[in-house]
């Protein structure tokens, strides 16, 4: 049986099938006659009962509320009610990244030590009966693997294995084709005693902004205790009074390394802040790694249709 949705806060990507499963499912079967209701509330709207008539995209099955697919306007709080049992979820539906085969905010980061075993298996237990094909991509390039149903990588890690692995499941429902993407950011580290510091996320980031508004550029890295993380911008740092480097935050990982985060806050964005590089660098005895941010006026961000899957 598929596990229930126990996490109270959930982020999903628009356009994908999605489901909520309440956690008193076995109980619900025992009391078939009991009234079971699903509700949604968002903003000014108070509890609105959901049923298949609410939307052609919504389906109710026993313990599950399904979305075919989930869309941005599905963001809100959801409730399941049965007798004196209530379960609540807060759902945040985010925009799909149309420039890539995956959406950055929906990436699961994993650290693998070099020469240690790891396995990526493209499986989706809830939708498996509906999936008619599945592809595995590395950095948005399709990997040619034997198994078309559950593509799998099983190996001892090498440094060249580092990258973004996206499992894309293609499925049909009511005559329509959908896809579900699950992406892992695999970071290969030397060993637990000494890692090569790495900045998390893409090397080049275009950030859509509005003039006069504020923006926070977050730079995160996996590093050793003695490594440093810093921002570089303009001819000399500090020349722009609207730019502030916030205090660095560090959290120790279970394997004794550090996850550091440093935010660059740009207030009252002006023309001079657009189309220039804001560089974040992590430095250690083993070398440096840099990622760049470029602020782009919202209107200038072209909407490229379709997914960027390369074969």
């Amino acid at each position: 049986a598929e596990s229930c949705t126990s996490r109270p806060h959930i982020t999903v990507v628009e356009g994908e099938p999605f489901y909520l499963k309440h956690c008193s499912c076995s109980l619900a079967h025992e009391i078939e006659t009991t009234t079971k209701s699903w509700y949604k509330s968002s903003g000014s709207q108070e509890h609105v009962e959901l049923n298949p008539r609410s939307s052609s995209r919504i389906a109710l099955h026993d313990c599950v509320l399904e979305f075919w697919p989930v869309e941005l306007n599905d963001t809100g709080s959801y409730f399941f009610q049965m007798k004196n049992y209530t379960q609540k979820w807060k759902l945040n539906v985010i925009r799909r990244n149309k420039h890539s085969c995956f959406t950055e905010r929906q990436v699961t980061s994993k650290i693998v030590e070099v020469k240690k075993f790891f396995q990526i298996t493209c499986e989706n237990s809830y939708y498996q009966t509906l999936v008619n094909s599945t592809s595995l991509y590395k950095n948005c390039k399709k990997l040619l693997l034997e198994n078309n149903k559950n593509p799998t990588i099983k190996k001892n890690a090498e440094f060249e294995d580092q990258g973004y692995y996206s499992c894309v499941h293609f499925l049909h429902h009511n005559g329509k084709l959908f896809n579900i993407t699950k992406t892992f950011n695999i970071t290969i580290v030397e060993d637990r005693s000494n890692i090569v510091p790495v900045l998390l996320g893409p090397k080049l980031n275009h950030v859509a902004v509005e003039l006069g508004k504020n923006v926070r550029l977050n730079c995160s890295a996996l590093l050793n205790e003695e490594d440093v993380i810093y921002w570089m911008f303009g001819e000399e740092n500090g020349s722009d009074p609207n730019i502030h480097e916030e205090k660095e935050m560090r959290i120790m990982t279970p394997e004794g390394k550090w996850h550091a985060s440093k935010v660059l806050r740009i207030e009252n964005i002006g023309e001079s802040n657009l189309n220039v590089l804001y560089n974040c660098t992590v430095a250690s005895t083993g070398g440096t790694d840099t990622k760049s941010f470029i602020l782009v006026r919202k209107a200038d961000m072209a909407d490229i249709p379709g997914h960027v899957f390369t074969r």
């Epitope: 596990s3 229930c4 126990s6 240690k116 790891f118 298996t121 499986e123 279970p254």
Partner: nanobody
């Protein structure tokens, strides 16, 4: 979030046995999570002991130092994962942690792959 609780630790003579349990609180169903047992001895790095994958526990892993002595298993009815430790040695002395990872599709037995951790239970093996 997932909350894990280890139990079953204690003091035992070399050659003896212990069974550690890892239970989840609330509505979390452990059968949908990869579970790992890790240990940390004073002054040493945390190391992997044994791991079991989700989806029916099809994959298991044992560190070389415990192969043939330790067994990892699931009891889905009781929402618990066990680590049966036989023929214990003084070098098995450590704090034992259980950890869970719900990232369906990825599996490894390294602490960097696990997102949720218990508080740990002390195992002391006297000679």
């Amino acid at each position: 979030d997932v909350q894990l609780q280890e139990s079953g630790g204690g003091l035992v003579q070399a050659g003896g046995s212990l069974r550690l349990s890892c239970a989840a609180s609330g509505f979390t169903l452990l059968d949908s999570y990869d579970i790992g047992w890790f240990r940390q001895a004073p002054g040493k790095k945390r190391e992997e002991v044994s791991c079991i994958s989700s989806s029916g526990g099809k994959s298991t892993y044992y560190a070389d130092s415990v192969k043939g002595r330790f067994t990892i298993s699931r009891d889905n009815a009781n929402n618990t994962v066990y680590l049966q430790m036989n023929s214990l040695k003084p070098e098995d002395t450590a704090v034992y942690y259980c950890a869970a990872d719900g990232a369906e599709g990825f599996w490894s037995c390294q602490s960097g792959g696990y997102d949720y951790w218990g508080q740990g239970t002390q195992v002391t093996v006297s000679s």
